[in-house]
Interface confidence: low
Amino acid sequence: QQQTLPKPFIWAEPHFMVPKEKQVTICCQGNYGAVEYQLHFEGSLFAVDRPKPPERINKVKFYIPDMNSRMAGQYSCIYRVGELWSEPSNLLDLVVTEMYDTPTLSVHPGPEVISGEKVTFYCRLDTATSMFLLLKEGRSSHVQRGYGKVQAEFPLGPVTTAHRGTYRCFGSYNNHAWSFPSEPVKLLVTGDIENTSLAPEDPTFPADTWGTYLLTTETGLQKDHALWDHTAQNLLR
């Protein structure tokens, strides 16, 4: 006989990185027929929702209208069908951003490179922080951590065209409180070095900057619950 139900999926909309004083919704998707969902924050019960009618609903939303550092941390959810409880979801790391300062992101040797080059990102923030995070935007929402007194180095090693994309960095004051995002840097990787002639002397950084760093539903990220689960779980480990 089954002792627990499968764990639910947990994710944040529009994103797990939430600017301070902005709103965020934590979503928990279990099974149809679940009569109760519990949201836990840092190991303690945070909120409860009882969907009506339970047989037609398999997802609940917990709304946070005003994000701040006290609300940032690790969330998980569970649900109940009858008297049977589910396994807890994976942990969702909810991060408050736009704290204090804005770092500077630079890339060496430049934003336009060729396959085989060794590329390094540098994230600099003069205020007291020792952890930095580099994010490549896109479906994987890949995050790297780096350490340094005022600057962290993120060596990508010899790049391939898979490294193409837009990167931003944050300074981290603690695991769940990050700085404002840096301006984006778009890394362009052209084909094999053996077939590429020298480019002009002076690389220029891309002029386009995004109005917001929050990923929108157009990216499809929020729809991919398993991916969000995976991203959130591995973000700060």
Partner: antibody, heavy 120, light 107 residues
Framework: QVQLVQSGAEVKKPGSSVKVSCKAS????????INWGRQAPGQGLEWIGE????????YYNEKFKAKATITADKSTSTAYMELSSLRSEDTAVYFC?????????????WGQGTTVTVSS | DIQMTQSPSSLSASVGDRVTITCRAS??????LNWYQQKPGKAPKLLIY???RLHSGVPSRFSGSGSGTDFTFTISSLQPEDIATYFC?????????FGGGTKVEIK
């Protein structure tokens, strides 16, 4: 065209310090790494360290960490290397060199060299 | 540190000869190997980067090959203006290190 112009020859007493400059022109100074190296009489080249003028980040050869301090002034597009506690074995030609456009760690343009002679 | 061993340390050849210099790294450096030319009293000049890529303005008689630990630099037809010392340099791991140099003279 790209040019790196170094300061003139120096004669120094043992125990003193010297600061060599490298003025860059013909390209965007903050986009490229400046390396420093040296060549003792009749010897090969040794890499001392490098600086990213855009961010001020330094890397040093462990051998020269206590000897050399590399800085850059973005406003004048000039890189500097200060050598302290000079000894006779620091007598050498010191070069600055720009690391190339690509991340292949080649030095594509070099200064003309600055001779530093340490003698009592 | 990665040691770069260059051979021969000097050579003498006639104008028009094919000249070959080798450079061996103490560990795998992939293709991050560069070659420079230095004439007496002058700064080095970059000739070849990433093993085989010719720097802009460098004559095509200069070429490079190799991978991993063993590399070769070739002048296909030696010219009088090629009299110089040639250095290899690894760009795989800091500290960047140079070979001891090969002095090329005309017979």
């Amino acid at each position: 065209q790209v040019q790196l112009v170094q300061s003139g020859a120096e004669v120094k007493k043992p125990g003193s310090s010297v600061k060599v400059s490298c003025k860059a022109s013909g390209y965007t100074f903050t986009d490229y790494v400046i390396n420093w190296g040296r060549q003792a009489p009749g010897q090969g080249l040794e890499w001392i360290g490098e600086i990213y003028p855009g961010s001020g980040t330094n890397y040093y050869n462990e051998k020269f960490k206590a000897k050399a301090t590399i800085t850059a002034d973005k406003s004048t597009s000039t890189a500097y290397m200060e050598l302290s506690s000079l000894r006779s074995e620091d007598t050498a030609v010191y070069f600055c060199a720009r690391r190339g456009r690509y991340g292949l760690y080649a030095m594509d343009y070099w200064g003309q060299g600055t001779t530093v002679t340490v003698s009592s | 540190d990665i040691q770069m061993t260059q051979s021969p340390s000097s050579l003498s050849a006639s104008v028009g000869d094919r000249v070959t210099i080798t450079c061996r790294a103490s560990q795998d450096i992939s293709n991050y190997l560069n070659w420079y030319q230095q004439k007496p009293g002058k700064a080095p000049k970059l000739l070849i980067y990433y093993t085989s890529r010719l720097h802009s303005g460098v004559p095509s008689r200069f070429s490079g090959s190799g991978s991993g630990t063993d590399f070769t630099f070739t002048i296909s037809s030696l010219q009088p203006e090629d009299i110089a010392t040639y250095f290899c340099q690894q760009g795989n791991t800091r500290p960047w290190t140079f070979g001891g140099g090969t002095k090329v003279e005309i017979k």
